[in-house]
């Protein structure tokens, strides 16, 4: 059996069949003789008891209040009362989008990774026995699928699969034709699994400097969102007042990874800054990667092969 309507705030589109089912249904069957009442209140109207005479569009049976169909003026608060049990819903009926096969407010978005399993299944368990046929549309164009009772797509996702998929169930009630639409916005993305972070450039960098001048050491990496990039130098980081770590800069790549750079600024370079390792490390769940910078006096450049220099 279809479960109850538990969400207290419900938005529905005008012109579609709709139902409210209270959540003490099993209990209600046990006490058949108990008075069960449905009420509506909206704006100035206080609680008005609902019954089939209230409107030809309203049907009451067992635990359910049905609308055939729901219309804009059905907006309001609804109450089910039985003995000391009360359940309340706030119903908001919105206008149908006349220019589309679906209404944007009624969309369920899902993000699927390319090559991963992707499925759309058109089912409606409550109205199942009344459904004549069901059609599946992609971007409001009907898809030709074998099963016209429960159309289904099951495949490995490709980028071309991206789009709005609308399941439209057609059903008859009291000689009238109705339809119910359920729409999914499917976005196909690149593989989101984590990469092994990598520091860009050579692992060892000799930087030619002049005493008394400033230098900026730039450390860049391709990494995951949660990975960290940091500098290590000297006995204790921060002991040299001339050394400053600048704020990390991050730019997201089209693949959803991050390009990060962190600058170490050394001001008023002294002898103590020469020939020591300034290490930049990227750390992730999968381990770490480190690259090193060594400051060398410009006069000593001739002793080091040119290809190891970072200008």
């Amino acid at each position: 059996a279809e479960s109850c309507t538990s969400r207290p705030h419900i938005t529905v589109v005008e012109g579609e069949p709709f139902y409210l089912k209270h959540c003490s249904c099993s209990l209600a069957h046990e006490i058949e003789t108990t008075t069960k009442s449905w009420y509506k209140s909206s704006g100035s109207q206080e609680h008005v008891e609902l019954n089939p005479r209230s409107s030809s569009r309203i049907a009451l049976h067992d635990c359910v209040l049905e609308f055939w169909p729901v219309e804009l003026n059905d907006t309001g608060s609804y109450f089910f009362q039985m003995k000391n049990y009360t359940q309340k819903w706030k119903l908001n009926v919105i206008r149908r989008n006349k220019h589309s096969c679906f209404t944007e407010r009624q969309v369920t978005s899902k993000i699927v990774e390319v090559k991963k399993f992707f499925q759309i299944t058109c089912e409606n368990s409550y109205y199942q026995t009344l459904v004549n046929s069901t059609s599946l549309y992609k971007n409001c164009k009907k898809l030709l699928l074998e099963n016209n009772k429960n159309p289904t797509i099951k495949k490995n996702a490709e980028f071309e699969d991206q789009g709005y998929y609308s399941c439209v169930h057609f059903l008859h009630h009291n000689g009238k034709l109705f339809n119910i639409t359920k729409t999914f916005n499917i976005t196909i993305v690149e593989d989101r699994s984590n990469i092994v972070p990598v520091l860009l450039g050579p692992k060892l960098n000799h930087v030619a400097v002049e005493l008394g001048k400033n230098v900026r050491l730039n450390c860049s990496a391709l990494l995951n969102e949660e990975d960290v990039i940091y500098w290590m130098f000297g006995e204790e980081n921060g002991s040299d007042p001339n050394i400053h770590e600048e704020k990390e800069m991050r730019i997201m790549t089209p693949e959803g990874k991050w390009h990060a750079s962190k600058v170490l600024r050394i001001e008023n370079i002294g002898e103590s800054n020469l020939n020591v390792l300034y290490n930049c490390t990227v750390a992730s769940t999968g381990g770490t990667d480190t690259k090193s910078f060594i400051l060398v006096r410009k006069a000593d450049m001739a002793d080091i092969p040119g290809h190891v220099f970072t200008r």
């Epitope: 279809e2 479960s3 109850c4 309507t5 538990s6 969400r7 207290p8 705030h9 938005t11 959540c23 944007e104 407010r105 009624q106 969309v107 369920t108 978005s109 899902k110 993000i111 499925q119 299944t121 916005n185």
Partner: antibody, heavy 121, light 111 residues
């Protein structure tokens, strides 16, 4: 009326895994999405991911991709969240919470009581 | 991904004061007349509690002194007259797209 009941507190060693359960009662289990939100001590709320019980579709916050696994058992209206390769930063209160399936309705009106997970050597 | 920037991170106010918290999304969270922004209250040791949904709708049972407004990227949460029981941390949350995201929170204290 609607209730989400979570499993009890856990103490784990770094590198281990933890599996937290969340049982839903008295409501349309398969018409709502279930989410996991965590809160480290003294920190804010962090959305971890979601599962649609109707088809087991999952989507994870990139931060937890590959480490978190959300599953559902519709026969018992229970969702599970397993977090592997635990580290001390995973010490937090883990909440399950429910929302509607439409994008507009993905706000959290019912919450579990929270499960404290402590990661310590 | 949509980043949420909430301000201030903390604030101190007196009972009866009007309190305003803002939340800015890194891109629009509004579509066709709806804004997919929601507000929560969290007291120490408790689960968060929904106060406002879809930018301006008051959750059932929440006092009318709480309100929300805004559209696009800029949203405001207001307590018209601060009460002692309102001491808590407040969070905004967007549901325009996955991944869902929260603001970093605003801790509200009584002067």
């Amino acid at each position: 009326q609607v209730q989400l009941v979570q499993s009890g507190a856990e103490v784990k060693k770094p590198g281990a895994s933890v599996k937290v359960s969340c049982k839903a009662s008295d409501y349309t289990f398969t018409s709502n999405w279930m989410h996991w939100v965590r809160q480290a001590p003294g920190q804010g709320l962090e959305w971890m991911g979601t599962i649609d019980p109707s088809d087991s579709y999952t989507y994870y916050n990139q931060k937890f991709q590959g480490r978190a696994t959300m599953t559902v058992d519709t026969s018992t209206s229970t969702v599970y969240m397993e977090l592997s390769s635990l580290r001390s930063e995973d010490t937090a209160v883990y909440y399950c919470t429910t929302s509607g399936d439409y994008d507009a309705d993905r706000y959290f009106d019912v919450w579990g009581q929270g499960t404290t997970v402590t990661v310590s050597s | 991904d949509i980043q949420m920037t909430q301000s201030p991170s903390s604030l101190s106010a007196s009972v009866g004061d009007r309190v305003t918290i803002t939340c800015q999304a890194s891109k629009s969270v509004s579509t066709s007349g709806d804004s997919y922004m929601h507000w929560y209250q969290q007291k120490p040791g408790k689960a968060p509690k929904l106060l406002i949904y879809l930018a301006s709708n008051l959750e059932t049972g929440v006092p009318s002194r709480f309100s929300g407004s805004g559209s696009g990227t800029d949203f405001t949460f207001t307590i018209s007259s601060l009460q002692p029981e309102d001491i808590a941390t407040y969070y905004c949350q967007q549901s325009r797209e996955l991944p869902l995201s929260f603001g970093q929170g605003t801790k509200l204290e009584i002067k």
